[in-house]
Amino acid sequence: MMTGTIETTGNISAKKGGSVILQCHLSSTMAQVTQVNWEQHDHSLLAIRNAELGWHIYPAFKDRVAPGPGLGLTLQSLTMNDTGEYFCTYHTYPDGTYRGRIFLEVLESSVAEHSARFQIP
């Protein structure tokens, strides 16, 4: 039985042209994280954080994605097309995979509020 839980930044909004931090946190498990995958709503991989090899940012996102903080991801120069779901997948021994979901809404408005509260989906 998998005992861990993934906490994520939940539903967040940010300004067009701005940046946002996508963050997942695995807790309540002794499992060892060997890799974290970050995917976009269309299932395309943005980045991988491998325990041995470190970060790999996929070419299509190299200009707009920065690794970190921690196992999280920073998305920069946001466009309206960035609106949608993002998933973190933690590969852990011996528990298996844990998956977290974040919904990002990119707003035209200059009063866009970037909420970064942690919540368990």
Partner: antibody
Framework: QVQLVQSGSELKKPGASVKVSCKAS????????MNWVRQAPGQGLEWMGW????????TYAQGFTGRFVFSLDTSVSTAYLQISSLKAEDTAVYYC???????????????WGQGTTVTVSS | DIRLTQSPSFLSASVGDRVTITCRAS??????LAWYQQKPGKAPKLLIY???TLQSGVPSRFSGSGSGTEFTLTISSLQPEDFATYYC????????FGGGTKVEIK
Amino acid sequence: QVQLVQSGSELKKPGASVKVSCKASGYTFTSYPMNWVRQAPGQGLEWMGWINTNTGNPTYAQGFTGRFVFSLDTSVSTAYLQISSLKAEDTAVYYCARVGGFTVPEYAFDIWGQGTTVTVSS
Amino acid sequence: DIRLTQSPSFLSASVGDRVTITCRASQGISSYLAWYQQKPGKAPKLLIYAASTLQSGVPSRFSGSGSGTEFTLTISSLQPEDFATYYCGQVMRYPAFGGGTKVEIK
């Protein structure tokens, strides 16, 4: 090359303690979980548990709690297995084994130490 | 806990024979199964992981198949160096090994 080198054979009396070492080389020690496996004479392989090489947290399989302790010294890339209050039935070959692969389907014990024979006899 | 049952426990075969070993899991484990070879006095060696992926350096006469609860290891043409004991193993949740299959010379 990637390898695990274990300490030599031990002959111990009942009630004594033993500490087996497993030194890793050729890879980043803290990137891969480490397991311990026991093989009694003429028997199969028995998983004893594992240690998280990032945090040092050990997890013990049923039957291996109490007298068995897993530990690490990451500064020398070494895992340890200590057994206290030794009994005749602890006589076995003890292996350390690394979990290879980074994604769940790839996980397997890909690198093994050569084994350490522990003999408990009066 | 997941239990792995191997069959047969012993197998007599000749060089050149096709050999098949079965491993059954007490509950579904997807493709999270590995096969190991062990020779007397030596440590086990990983042959196959993820049910069917050959470990680097392992001869192609070894193959694995199956998913869920039933898995097989096949040696297409047994060679003299293949006489050994074979174990299936799974590493998810509570890792475990099958009881082993000793492949002996007929």
